[in-house]
Amino acid sequence: VPRWRQQWSGPGTTKRFPETVLARCVKYTEIHPEMRHVDCQSVWDAFKGAFISKHPCNITEEDYQPLMKLGTQTVPCNKILLWSRIKDLAHQFTQVQRDMFTLEDTLLGYLADDLTWCGEFNTSKINYQSCPDWRKDCSNNPVSVFWKTVSRRFAEAACDVVHVMLNGSRSKIFDKNSTFGSVEVHNLQPEKVQTLEAWVIHGGREDSRDLCQDPTIKELESIISKRNIQFSCKNIYRPDKFLQCVKNPEDSSCTSEI
């Protein structure tokens, strides 16, 4: 590694990043007929153009606009599922409940899910050694700015009843500093979104507490209400049973509280 290369605190670009993005794009457009018109090479070029040759602490939402334009996608605005710190269950849910969508069920979210990337100022190289960490280095890094941009757009598109899955096992069930708390909550449009319904997912098998009483949930309720959006909260005591009942709603055990 050359001496002059900036050392960041976070992990470097995911190996085979260009190939991964391109392969994911091809796979997604094959599976989703409404996105068959998308030219994946152009998508990769726009993605690359957002961060290559740019200082990885000086990325802006504007840098991603060409990519956003190419990845424009219409999802049913009343079928949006947001999540915070509980990605796996949210994705398991939308895999079963196919008419609901997380951000990662959209093309742009699917492309970038679990990947890291950054470039270097004035060189066309991708940095596979290290990338800026949001806390330790800078917040305007390529990955953070990407997720902030797509999350904002996703929230802005939502309408009617929006659902959010929250992790009841965490000390802060609702965290103002999460993407949901800092971006999505503030970009739901009161003229379109009537109600935010929070699903608080319990971790412990014997946990019968009403986590809708948690102070952070009441904080979320307050923030949402001040934005003229109504609020609903439900405990999901048994996530395993919850998923099972989504798969088989006719099951006799699915009439009781989950």
Partner: antibody
Amino acid sequence: QVQLKQSGPGLVQPSQSLSITCTVSGFSLTNYGVHWLRQSPGKGLEWLGVIWRGGSTDYSAAFMSRLNITKDNSKSQVFFKMNSLQADDTAIYYCAKTTLTRVWYCDVWGAGTTVTVSS
Amino acid sequence: DIQMTQSSSSFSVSLGDRVTITCKSSEDIYNRLAWYQQKPGNAPRLLISGATSLETGVPSRFSGSGSGKDYTLSITSLQTEDVVTYYCQQYWNTPLTFGAGTKLELK
């Protein structure tokens, strides 16, 4: 099942105050808000105010100066007090439960308390 | 305050009719509209919220539509028990306000 039972006087003297208690069952006041409304032949249905699950309140500006809504979660009771009643406050007064945690419409209503303001 | 206007205070209907009740708000209420049914001597009963969402247990012959300032409640194949009074309510702004009601009466 979900019920709201109202208790309060039928007759109130002009300039006196009206107190109604709404005792709920089948749900917890820590999970739902309770709205107060009234209905009279002259003015139709009017919204007066709401107490949310956390205890905060919102009042109609027209009644804010003389209305107070409180509650006791442990007793499952909501208390409504309106001061300085006049003849045009004669109406049926209702308490009603919010459909979801914090919404502005109601799915279950009390039977109503018929209040006449007269000397 | 937002004014809610129900165009007809009463209208004559026949059993089996398709009935449409209209409600107009003085400003855009962004689908924040509820419909209630009230039988004589009873409290109002919630039928629809969010302009279109039917409450659990409400018969499917009831439906809501509309946007902006103009909303309608439709009843297909009117039944005897439906011949009562209907109110709309906006909840875009406080104070919450109601229409004056539309009373259905048999011809």
